[in-house]
Amino acid sequence: YFGKLESKLSVIRNLNDQVLFIDQGNRPLFEDMTDSDCRDNAPRTIFIISMYKDSQPRGMAVTISVKCEKISTLSCENKIISFKEMNPPDNIKDTKSDIIFFQRSVPGHDNKMQFESSSYEGYFLACEKERDLFKLILKKEDELGDRSIMFTVQNED
């Protein structure tokens, strides 16, 4: 069971300081942006992180949403990352969900965050370069200290 608590507005960056945004095709991508660029590209750079209380003491459960014309919420259904047109629900009567991630700080680095899928244990949100694009993907943690699964979360409230 997950019960929604509160939400905050955040900018999410990878460790190369690239900003996460949702492009015109609804794809989550990372791009180099100045602070001014980041503001100019809002709301596509502003993510709604909704926190949930979990029936199992596993960590801070969150959903990640964005509001452009409508609210879309990040999903890792079938281990594929996409934004689905939906509001973060008030509660989820299950112990796993494709839209719930556990946000945890990296041990020894309180300002760096990881997002582990509640549906796929050991799988984390990650940044991966594909051709010229830096994409948000779901990746199995395969090595300690993998920087691709670490992010900074800057509150905008």
């Epitope: 069971y1 019960g3 608590l5 509160e6 905050k8 926190m51 209380k53 979990d54 029936s55 199992q56 003491p57 596993r58 960590g59 801070m60 509660n91």
Partner: antibody
Framework: QVQLQESGPGLVKPSETLSLTCTVS??????????WSWIRQPPGKGLEWIGS???????YYNPSLKSRVTISGDTSKNQFSLKLSSVTAADTAVYYC?????????????????WGRGTLVTVSS | DIQMTQSPSTLSASVGDRVTITCRAS??????LAWYQQKPGKAPKVLIY???TLESGVPSRFSGSGSGTEFTLTISSLQPDDFATYYC?????????FGQGTKLEIK
């Protein structure tokens, strides 16, 4: 009403494994709705959650101790146990077992509502 | 992890006084906060959960308030039995974390 009682050696040598047992009376650890938890308190200091176990056997640990902690349950004896490996003097503390109502959308949850009396474990050679 | 910071660390007061202890969470925890009382050589005892709900059997002189990151425990009229150490605790997100404690002593 539910009562909890810790037991185990009061002295453990550095680098060895600390082992404690909590015996539950007046209630069953195998009925749902509660986690069974361990908390510790170094002398003159604050409280630290070590971890919890659910009746299903699922365990949840404080990340700061996870690599050294094992919590297990024995439903036939109505007991749950703590093992903490590779102890140092910093692990000297009063160790408490406690009951924790689980969260399923209600308010009365995730605090420690029933505690044992605590047992002092000293790590020293 | 969510850090819980209490103030003051020590509080001197007299029987009959109204006292307030403050607890600050390092990030918002809605109203998911508990208060415990601990006397020397004893296990902690829960007084309040969900920030303001009084545990059964706890005297009504104890009250809690706050949400988000700022919380308070108030004792409206101190009784001799109330001199103890008080802890706030995050019960929103694991790992469950406690404040460092506020020792309430006789002035």
């Amino acid at each position: 009403q539910v009562q909890l009682q810790e037991s185990g050696p009061g002295l453990v040598k550095p680098s060895e494994t600390l082992s404690l047992t909590c015996t539950v009376s007046g209630g069953s650890i195998s009925s749902g709705g509660y986690y069974w938890s361990w908390i510790r308190q170094p002398p003159g200091k604050g409280l630290e959650w070590i971890g919890s176990i659910y009746y299903s056997g699922s365990t949840y640990y404080n990340p700061s101790l996870k690599s050294r902690v094992t919590i297990s349950g024995d439903t036939s004896k109505n007991q749950f146990s703590l093992k903490l490996s590779s102890v140092t003097a910093a692990d000297t503390a009063v160790y408490y077992c406690a009951r924790t109502p689980a969260y399923f959308g209600q308010d009365r949850t995730d605090f420690f509502d029933v505690w044992g009396r605590g047992t002092l474990v000293t790590v020293s050679s | 992890d969510i850090q819980m910071t209490q103030s003051p660390s020590t509080l001197s007061a007299s029987v009959g006084d109204r006292v307030t202890i403050t607890c600050r969470a390092s990030q918002g925890i809605s109203s998911w906060l508990a208060w415990y009382q601990q006397k020397p050589g004893k296990a902690p005892k829960v007084l309040i959960y969900k920030a303001s709900t009084l545990e059964s059997g706890v005297p009504s002189r104890f009250s809690g308030s706050g949400s988000g990151t700022e919380f308070t425990l108030t004792i409206s009229s101190l009784q001799p039995d109330d001199f103890a150490t008080y802890y706030c605790a995050n019960i929103a997100f694991p790992p469950w974390t406690f404040g460092q404690g506020t020792k309430l002593e006789i002035k």
